[in-house]
């Protein structure tokens, strides 16, 4: 077969083929930020010629031309300014209302370089109606001037503009417009990735339902779902396998989808997963009739078996038929469950189609959408069984009114997005699933996402200040209760003076709670053993601080999770017989097990716990400190079986101000305390100049450097004492 | 917050011993860490001992290990530092401070004393 001739370059821009110069090749243009391909891609057809998907006429000149953003159209009851006919990125539009009017939205909005306006729209609005003014996104045009119930408006885009979100909106009863926000947008804009993570997160936590369903009550972000134990999620996963997505590509909307899946294991609802493959037909992978589909192993491994190759004979991109398949898969459990049962009309369904163009065969993927509502009865009150997300890759070939049509509409919420390449993908479900904004307590839950503030990352860590000055940390297990060291209280009882720290997201500084009780082991005493020879003594060195008030959970805020709990065991994704010993197993699994610690300046530090045979040789080393333990023969005298042992090898060693903070570990994206700080032989902050100076043990030092952290696995009698009605304890 | 206030300092001869003595009002004195810190003419002011509130552990920046003791007594309320084989590089002005979390950074340390001059000289 002839190839297509290689004279194809792009003045300032490169580009990319999906298989070289043979025919069917996909060519993509790229051009540098703030400016995009004209045209966005060229195919190779079976003649040996370059065709531009889409054009009329010949072929002319791959170039690429600056970015603009779409320019208001009309801005009702107020002024803007600059009036130029469209804008260049960096370049800025100002809101002014007429007097009785109250602007809101944003009063100054720059052009960002994908081509879209950052803030929000700008509406002066005077209250009036039974709905808010529901204003005129920028390069749009509405009819519809009342805004009582009932009443409708509706959009179109100026230009060669195109309209996402709702062309028709409804204003409720609830005095809430239905539908989503219309957005004008220039066929060649895309979504940054730090835009759709949120967005996506915040759709999907909201129907995830931020259920705990160890809680009575459950509230989520917005729309108030309840996904009780009972209730059930079946997510579809629709990856393109079309000719134009290159197998490199496709192993990204692999991995993304294995990303998604992991994540939305690690909720603690009931989830069942299917995975379709398409190109000119679908491929069901994994269907949601199938019991493996609720568990994360099974799924994951039929998306790695996914095969590229198994689209090679038909490579069309036939969307429907991928919608039909799950439509298929919906008729099918509905008639095994029965229409007319709970166990079917609970359930709620979230459809995410990767796609990189518009389809081309088989027909309106609409109508299968159109099928899906009807069998799963959605209206007004069945909005929330139902999300569509449809994200395009790739700004090539890409429909935006195809993609928008597909995705659901739902008020503040956005479900069709158009990304630059794979790569922003990956980003996107690396960090949408945030279950850290939820409002409930969720335990074990930080932001990992690579902007997130330190303590968005730990969110249950604390500081304790006796007066003025820091002396310990401690972690919240409950919303009114902080787990932490017994040494740090060495003041008797009055603890009137007493500050608790917590993260709040309103402060950089956090919030400071009063302690309304604290309550130290009474087995603590550090001069118990003064006697043989051990100057200081740190058995028993726990203790728990109730708050004067009750922690509003945030993102900044929020518990860890207690092994040995019901919280921590549904986190841990266990069966309900589990025990306490299930979970020990579970976290302290190996000879040397990765943990971590939060520093004074709030980073995250990496320590090792040693067990069995390398907890003796981690302790053994205490021998060497002859200031504190002048005369000591067994080093069990100092450090019991209740400690757990770090500060080998590259380890991080605590300073004393962190005592009684969290040593916790990483499980399924969830964090679990295993221990406290405690005590040390070596204080890397001894002397610094500030929290961020520590100073790294000589090789040389003798003792070397070992840090003991009260193991919570063997306080089990006295925490189940003390928080029996704060968390669900397992048996031991 | 606790009150201190230093003596002992003098002249000595290179070799020579001082005794440094930090006096501290106040009844939480024995829950406090308690330190030493140096600061030459023209030089950051550096860490020099600290004991533990219970007296059970202590810390010495390496230049004075082996030579100097820090030691306490809760009972008078009172700080010690004993410095023998005392060289030139030792002359400063040495402070007391108190620290309820035995890290004495430099940062956040409020309570220190108003200082004591050790000279070194022959």
């Known amino acids: 077969a002839p190839s297509c001739p290689q004279n194809v370059n792009i003045s300032g821009g490169t580009f990319t083929l999906s298989h070289g110069w043979a025919p069917g090749s996909l060519l993509t243009y790229s051009c540098p930020q703030g400016l995009y391909p004209s045209p966005a891609s060229r195919l190779c057809k079976s003649s040996g010629q370059w065709q531009t998907p889409g054009a009329t006429r010949s072929l002319s000149k791959a170039v690429c031309k600056p970015v603009r953003c779409p320019a208001p159209v009309s801005f009702e009851n107020g002024i803007y300014t600059p009036r130029l006919g469209s804008y260049p990125v960096g370049g800025n539009v100002s809101f002014e209302c007429e007097d009785g009017f109250i602007l809101r939205g944003s009063p100054v909005r720059q052009c960002r370089p994908n081509g879209m306006w950052d803030g929000e729209t700008a509406v002066c609005d005077n209250g009036a109606g039974h709905c808010p003014n529901p204003g005129i996104s920028l390069g749009a045009v509405r009819t519809g001037f009342r805004f009582g119930h009932g009443d409708k408006v509706r959009y179109r885009c100026s230009s060669n503009l195109v309209l996402t979100g709702s062309s028709e909106r409804e204003c409720q009863g609830n005095g809430v417009w239905s539908g989503t926000e219309p957005i004008c947008r220039q066929p060649y804009s895309y979504d940054f990735p730090e835009d759709v993570a949120p967005a996506l997160g915040t759709s999907f936590s909201h129907m995830l339902g931020a259920t705990n369903p160890t809680q009575k009550t459950k509230e989520s972000l917005g729309r108030k779902i309840q996904i009780q134990r009972s209730g059930h999620l079946n997510l579809y996963l629709l990856l393109d396998c079309s000719q134009s997505v290159s197998e490199n590509d496709f192993l990204i909307f692999k991995e993304s989808a294995s990303l998604m899946v992991d994540r939305i294991f690690s909720f603690e609802i009931n989830v069942s997963v299917a995975i379709i493959t398409f190109a000119s037909e679908p491929k069901v992978l994994m269907s949601v009739l199938n019991d493996n589909s609720r568990d994360m192993t099974e799924v994951i491994s039929s998306l790695e078996n996914a095969n590229y190759k198994d689209h090679e004979n038909g490579t069309g991109t036939n969307t429907y038929a991928a919608l039909n398949s799950v439509y298929l898969m919906m008729n099918n459990q509905m008639r095994l469950l029965g229409m007319e049962t709970m166990a079917w009309q609970e359930i709620r369904h979230a459809i995410i189609l990767l796609t990189d163009g518009k389809s081309n065969m088989g027909g309106s993927p609409k109508t299968a959408v159109d099928h899906i509502r009807e069998i799963l009865n959605i209206n007004q009150k069945r909005n929330d069984y139902l999300d569509i997300y449809a994200i395009g890759v790739g700004k090539l070939d890409v429909d935006w009114r195809e993609l928008n049509e597909l995705g659901s509409k739902k008020d503040g919420e956005r479900h069709a997005f158009i990304l630059q390449d794979t790569k922003a993908l990956h980003q996107v479900f690396e960090h949408m699933l945030d279950v850290s904004k939820l409002t409930d307590t969720i335990c074990g839950v930080g932001n990992m996402s690579a902007n997130a503030s330190d303590q968005e990352r730990t969110p249950w860590h604390v500081t304790i200040k006796p007066k003025s000055q820091e002396t310990c940390r401690g972690a919240l297990i409950s919303d009114q209760w902080v787990l932490t060291a017994a040494h740090c209280f060495r003041d008797g009882n009055d603890h009137s003076l007493w500050r608790v720290n917590v993260g709040d997201p309103k402060s950089q500084w956090g919030k400071e709670f009063l302690i309304e009780k604290a309550v130290i082991s009474p087995g603590f005493d550090v001069f118990a053993k003064k006697n043989q020879g051990i100057l200081e003594f740190y058995g028993d060195d726990i203790a728990l601080l109730k708050l004067a008030q009750k922690v509003k959970m945030s993102t900044h805020a929020r518990p860890i999770c207690l092994p040995c709990t019901m919280e921590a065991n549904l986190a841990l994704r266990r069966p309900q017989g589990s025990t306490c010993r299930d979970h020990e197993n579970e976290l302290l699994n190996k000879q040397s097990v990765p943990a971590h610690f939060v520093a004074l300046n709030g980073s995250k530090l990496n320590i090792n716990l040693k067990m069995g045979v390398e907890w003796t040789s981690c302790a053994e080393v205490v021998s060497q400190e002859k200031t504190m333990f002048p005369n000591l023969t067994d080093v069990r005298e100092v450090v019991t079986d209740q400690f757990l042992c770090s500060g080998t090898q590259e380890d991080e060693s605590p300073c004393k101000g962190e005592s009684g903070g969290a040593v916790f570990l990483e499980r399924r994206f969830r964090f679990f305390q295993v221990g406290l700080v405690s005590w040390g032989l070596y204080n890397p902050c001894l002397g610094s100049a500030d929290k961020n100076s520590r100073k790294r043990a000589p090789r040389s030092k003798v003792p070397p450097p070992r840090d003991f952290h009260i193991n919570l696995f063997r306080m089990q009698p006295w925490l189940r004492q003390h928080l029996g009605d704060v968390l669900n304890f397992l048996p031991l | 917050q606790v009150q201190l206030v230093e003596s002992g300092g003098g002249l000595v001869q290179p070799g020579g011993s001082l005794r440094l003595s930090c006096s501290a009002s106040?009844?939480?004195?024995?829950?406090?860490?308690m330190g030493w810190f140096r600061q030459a003419p023209g030089k950051e002011r550096e860490f020099v001992a600290s004991?533990?509130?219970?007296?059970?552990?202590?810390e010495y920046a390496d230049s004075v290990k082996g030579r100097f003791t820090i030691s306490r007594d809760n009972s008078k309320n009172t700080l010690y530092l004993q410095m023998n084989s005392l060289r030139a590089e030792d002359t400063a002005v040495y402070y007391c401070a108190a620290d309820y979390s035995g890290d004495f950074l430099l940062s956040d340390l409020d309570s220190w004393g108003q200082g004591t001059q050790v000279t070194v000289s022959s």
């Open positions: 106040g009844h939480t004195f024995r829950s406090y860490y």
């Open positions: 004991i533990s509130w219970t007296g059970g552990s202590t």
